[in-house]
């Protein structure tokens, strides 16, 4: 059973992930972002189901494409280089979902834009955080 300290750690990691995703979304939605039109042409895949930490596998598998999209944006829109930002997110996601269990992600049929994709995972983080508090 999860201890209060492990729950707190999970909550903090989710909050960190949430802030990173929100920062990316804000950077992309910046009205000065000249690459937004092109960014919106990139297709992202959404999970059929995202209710547990193991479903973060679906986010992890989209982090490569996410890094490529962020490479299009002006670096000043973000505090970190895309490579470093995605590296940080990968560390958090790996700690949250664990590396031992090999969960195969199931994707929804419909693809999403980067904005829809980020909003989906922001909602996921908020939902899990709310169950922990």
């Amino acid at each position: 059973a999860p201890t209060s300290s492990s729950t707190k750690k999970t909550q903090l990691q989710l909050e960190h992930l949430l802030l990173d995703l929100q920062m990316i979304l804000n950077g992309i939605n910046n009205y000065k972002n000249p690459k937004l039109t092109r960014m919106l042409t990139f297709k992202f895949y959404m999970p059929k189901k995202a209710t547990e930490l193991k479903h973060l596998q679906c986010l992890e598998e989209e982090l490569g494409p996410l890094e490529e999209v962020l490479n299009l944006a002006q670096s000043k829109n973000f505090h970190l280089r895309p490579r470093d930002l995605i590296s940080n997110i990968r560390v958090i996601v790996l700690e949250l979902k664990g590396s031992e269990t090999t969960f195969m992600c199931e994707y929804a049929d419909e693809t999403a834009t980067i904005v829809e994709f980020l909003n989906r995972w922001i909602t996921f983080c908020q939902s899990i955080i709310s169950t922990l508090t």
């Epitope: 042409t41 598998e61 490569g64 490529e68 790996l94 195969m104």
Partner: antibody
């Protein structure tokens, strides 16, 4: 169906420069990141680098930096890979291949390949 | 750089037999691994992507699996046209790296 057609075989002397082309047909080149991979005779595959033809941004493998230049001409849907200061170890078949994030998940991998261009470096 | 180690270097089997090819990553790469088949004088052909997904036009006898940093390509029942060299590739981070290859030959 996307096809990649590469230029013909080249024979070069050590120290020379070679420039190989890769023409995309069946779609526009700007939909793809164009990658280059090489294979020495009887050896495995080695990633050289890639270009985003939309904005000409490039990424190169560390061991090719300074010697390789990847470019693209969107008006002709053609990518180029130029390798300078050639040495005998550069004798290999050079392939262009693609990645795209605009279509299916499968096409995020090296799904389309050129037929390969043999570059022979010999004195 | 991420190193991919393929084993065995050569696998000698007969048509109809089951082939199991291994690829081990030097660090965690999630499912960012694909498998390619290459025949002499030809370009590589994508077989499996994202560790377990079958590429379009590839027969169902090919399958991929993953356990941690260990990846496996299985050919359930070998056909004569399956004898070739197989490579794994990681897309987790640049530089993208390939395994050294496994040659599948007729016994």
């Amino acid at each position: 169906q996307v096809q990649l057609v590469q230029s013909g075989a080249e024979v070069k002397k050590p120290g020379a420069t070679v420039k190989i082309s890769c023409k995309v047909s069946g779609d526009t080149i700007t939909a793809y990141y164009m990658h280059w991979v090489r294979q020495a005779p009887g050896q495995g595959l080695e990633w050289i680098g890639r270009i985003d033809p939309e904005d000409d941004s490039t990424k190169y493998a560390e061991n090719f930096k300074g010697r390789v230049t990847i470019t693209a001409d969107t008006s002709t849907d053609t990518a180029y890979m130029e390798l300078s200061s050639l040495r005998s170890e550069d004798t290999a078949v050079y392939y262009c291949t693609t990645i795209t994030f605009l279509y299916t998940r499968e096409l995020r991998w090296f799904a389309y390949w050129g037929q390969g261009t043999l570059v022979t470096v010999s004195s | 750089d991420i190193v991919l180690t393929q084993s065995p270097a050569t696998l000698s089997l007969s048509p109809g037999e089951r082939a199991t090819l291994s690829c081990q990553a030097s660090q965690y790469i999630s499912n960012y691994l694909s498998w390619y088949q290459q025949k002499p004088g030809q370009a590589p052909r994508l077989l499996i992507y994202s560790a377990t997904s079958l590429a379009s036009g590839i027969p169902a006898r090919f399958s991929g699996s993953r356990s941690g940093t260990d990846f496996t390509l299985t050919i359930s029942s070998l056909e004569p046209e399956d004898f070739a060299v197989y490579y794994c590739l990681q897309h987790y981070s640049t530089p993208y790296t390939f395994g050294q290859g496994t040659k599948l030959e007729i016994k």
